[in-house]
């Protein structure tokens, strides 16, 4: 296994609809054809998997149907979008990239993106 550099933004603020997007860029040392991208969340001394997708270079990134993540890939960049976020989901979201094929296997872990989620205030009752 070999190490690989992964870059991602330090901070992202989720939209009022609970959607956060960020780019995960990896420095591919070779010509990988199969790449696995995993989003991890670190909070309260625990790391949990948020979502994961394996894709072939040049093809679309496909997450499971019930995943809260969507994404697109372009070269060595993956554009990730996480939806359905609430204030309690605030935390450090880490991009993990694995070059699965061809060998050798490479592993890269980003420094994490701190995603802040603010629940919208409920609208006051209107007389109209």
């Amino acid at each position: 296994c070999k190490a690989m550099h992964v870059a991602q933004p330090a901070v992202v603020l989720a939209s009022s609809r609970g959607i956060a997007s960020f780019v995960c860029e990896y420095a591919s040392p070779g010509k990988a054809t199969e790449v696995r991208v995993t989003v991890l969340r670190q909070a309260d001394s625990q790391v949990t998997e948020v979502c994961a997708a394996t894709y072939m270079m040049g093809n679309e990134l496909t997450f499971l149907d019930d995943s809260i993540c969507t994404g697109t890939s372009s070269g060595n960049q993956v554009n990730l979008t996480i939806q359905g976020l609430r204030a309690m989901d605030t935390g450090l979201y880490i991009c993990k990239v694995e070059l699965m094929y061809p060998p050798p296997y490479y592993l890269g872990i980003g420094n994490g993106t701190q995603i802040y989620v603010i629940d919208p205030e409920p609208c006051p009752d209107s007389d109209f």
Epitope: C1, A3, L40, Q42, S45, Q46, V47, T48, L92, I94, L107, I109, G110, N111, G112
Partner: nanobody, 126 residues
């Protein structure tokens, strides 16, 4: 709250083997840096081994190099210390320690640890 629990200690003859396990209750050890320490009677506690959060880096004290092997068993949410060719001087209480570092340090062993287990006794004697 995560707690560390060691198991696998016991009495073994010189030259024998033991397999210590460090498991987590109340959470997972995924990406935690895990260290193994031991304390022999009348001696200071010493670190014998550690494994990084990714599992790619392992360190060993000179006294156990080539005899001890540390590994992660993610399927069982545990870290294993395989001890071979045991000697009388390996006798002591073995402690599992852990710390979840910032992701930028997941490929390294921790310099200090937040969490300690209760320890398991290892006795090497004929």
């Amino acid at each position: 709250e995560v707690q560390l629990v060691e198991s696998g200690g016991g009495l073994v003859q010189p030259g024998g083997s033991l397999r210590l396990s460090c498991a987590a209750s109340g959470g997972t050890l995924d990406y935690w840096s895990i260290g193994w320490f031991r304390q022999a009677p009348g001696k200071e506690r010493e670190e014998v081994s550690c494994i990084s959060g990714t599992g790619l880096r392992t360190n060993y004290a000179d006294s156990v190099k080539g005899r001890f092997t540390v590994s992660r068993d993610n399927s069982k949410n545990s870290v294993i210390l395989q001890m071979n060719s045991l000697r009388a001087e390996d006798t002591g209480v073995y402690y599992c320690t852990g710390k979840l570092l910032h992701p930028s340090l997941w490929s390294a062993c921790a310099n200090e640890y937040d969490l300690w287990g209760q320890g398991t006794q290892v006795t090497v004697s004929s």
